[in-house]
Amino acid sequence: LMGGQDKPFLSARPSTVVPRGGHVALQCHYRRGFNNFMLYKEDRSHVPIFHGRIFQESFIMGPVTPAHAGTYRCRGSRPHSLTGWSAPSNPLVIMVTGNHRKPSLLAHPGPLLKSGETVILQCWSDVMFEHFFLHREGISEDPSRLVGQIHDGVSKANFSIGPLMPVLAGTYRCYGSVPHSPYQLSAPSDPLDIVITGLYEKPSLSAQPGPTVQAGENVTLSCSSWSSYDIYHLSREGEAHERRLRAVPKVNRTFQADFPLGPATHGGTYRCFGSFRALPCVWSNSSDPLLVSVTGNPSSSWPSPTEPSSKSGICRHLH
């Protein structure tokens, strides 16, 4: 979608959503290439903010402050025209984050969904935000915007995402804004990873020494598959957290991860999923559920020597 005829195309890398103190590269693409260009910020004076400065290829703007938030345009160099410059580009809105307290982000029915399903991402805050923005990590397009609905001292907006495909999986954050400064967004919500399952064949899940164990006996759950998964994810019914481990190639050509659960004190139903490093938020079908039973005197918790990963971070690579 390059600028048509005499209109250049202005874009931002890595994103139009920039944290306070961060940097953003503004690129003005003109006539099948990056020529010299001039930048304008639309404000009440309608004059270039970079007076007389000419940029090549791109301009790294930063460290950004709230004053950098707003609408930008560029003009490409056109030596043989009367003015020497092209028509103004498309408008590009730069949003600066970190200007108000962060909102909260929740997924309904949950962050783990099957391909084709729809998820509602609810952004809410006790700050009376007029608008909420939803942004997916790594995407350079403008974030989705919704008007906040205010009830009982809480402002919220529901973003509907779906039907879910692999391209929609990833790490989401939401922001709030007020009309006083519409392009100065709040701090980001805590990240929320939306995971799509059901794209690849299911792994198998087994328990050592077996699915029924004595209280206090050490239990290890093994997830394995013939598919060359890079990572396995183990989830326990009723728990928000999942554990993940790198898959290890075995002599029998399977790929396996062994999850040590420690001394058995409490049973539960477990499932595991496989995923590839390139698409960490796109998981296989679930393994068949495995019910682990503990005989003896079960207590209310199962201490885990491997710290479960946080609610977020699923979509980051394991190094």
Partner: antibody, heavy 118, light 112 residues
């Protein structure tokens, strides 16, 4: 309940400095912006600017750039208006008001009267 | 700056009458987000202003339903269906769509 309580009346000489306080209670201070509004004797209301209570970032109307400064003491949930090098035309009642979301002044302080006289 | 012009300057009314105050902006006050941040305030003698209406027509909590706001673009109106003694004072319109935010000059509602 939500309250904005301002400091008492001030009598100053031209050239001096005054600092007016606005103490907020009954709500989360950093969730709302704070406006400052001037009302000269027998005149209408004039918006001076506002301060973002989360970041401390002030915005001033053109007529109030230079001698005027907004500041915060977040731990004390208090906003301040300081006027330096006082002039006779600064004689007025100054109001603080809370704003955010859809409304720009849902709660107001009672006003602080500043008298400037030599 | 957006100039907010209120008419009339003074409005003498009898209690129980309907009152109407007009406010005109020198340019459209539709915000870039599509909303119109036009508010109405009442200031009684010796008191701070009180918010009556926000976003053109929304009554602030606790404001009696005899107060209503309307209008769009550059022309706005505040109506009081049956004036009561407690309604007397100076009414100000205010725009928060374009910086600097600006107040109208005020309309004094008084007893005939």
């Amino acid at each position: 309940q939500i309250q904005l309580v301002q400091s008492g009346p001030e009598l100053k000489k031209p050239g001096e400095t005054v600092k007016i306080s606005c103490k907020a209670s009954g709500y989360t201070f950093t969730n709302y912006g704070m406006n400052w509004v001037k009302q000269a004797p027998g005149k209408g209301l004039k918006w001076m600017g506002w301060i973002n209570t989360y970041t401390g970032e002030p915005t001033y109307a053109d007529d109030f750039k230079g001698r005027f400064a907004f500041s915060l003491e977040t731990s004390a949930t208090t906003a301040y208006l300081q006027i330096n090098n006082l002039k006779n035309e600064d004689m007025a009642t100054y109001f603080c008001s809370r704003s955010f979301g859809s409304t720009y002044g849902d709660y107001w302080g009672q006003g602080t009267t500043l008298t400037v006289s030599s | 700056d957006v100039l907010m012009t209120q008419t009339p300057l003074s409005l003498p009314v009898s209690l129980g009458d309907q009152a109407s105050i007009s406010c005109r902006s020198s340019q459209t006050i539709v915000h870039s987000n599509g909303n119109t941040y036009l508010e109405w305030y009442l200031q009684k003698p010796g008191q701070s202003p009180k918010l009556l209406i926000y976003k053109v027509s929304n009554r602030f909590s606790g404001v009696p339903d005899r107060f209503s706001g309307s209008g769009s673009g550059t022309d706005f109106t505040l109506k009081i269906s049956r004036v009561e003694a407690e309604d007397l004072g100076v009414y100000y319109c205010f725009q928060g769509s374009h910086v600097p935010w600006t107040f109208g000059g005020g309309t004094k509602l008084e007893i005939k």
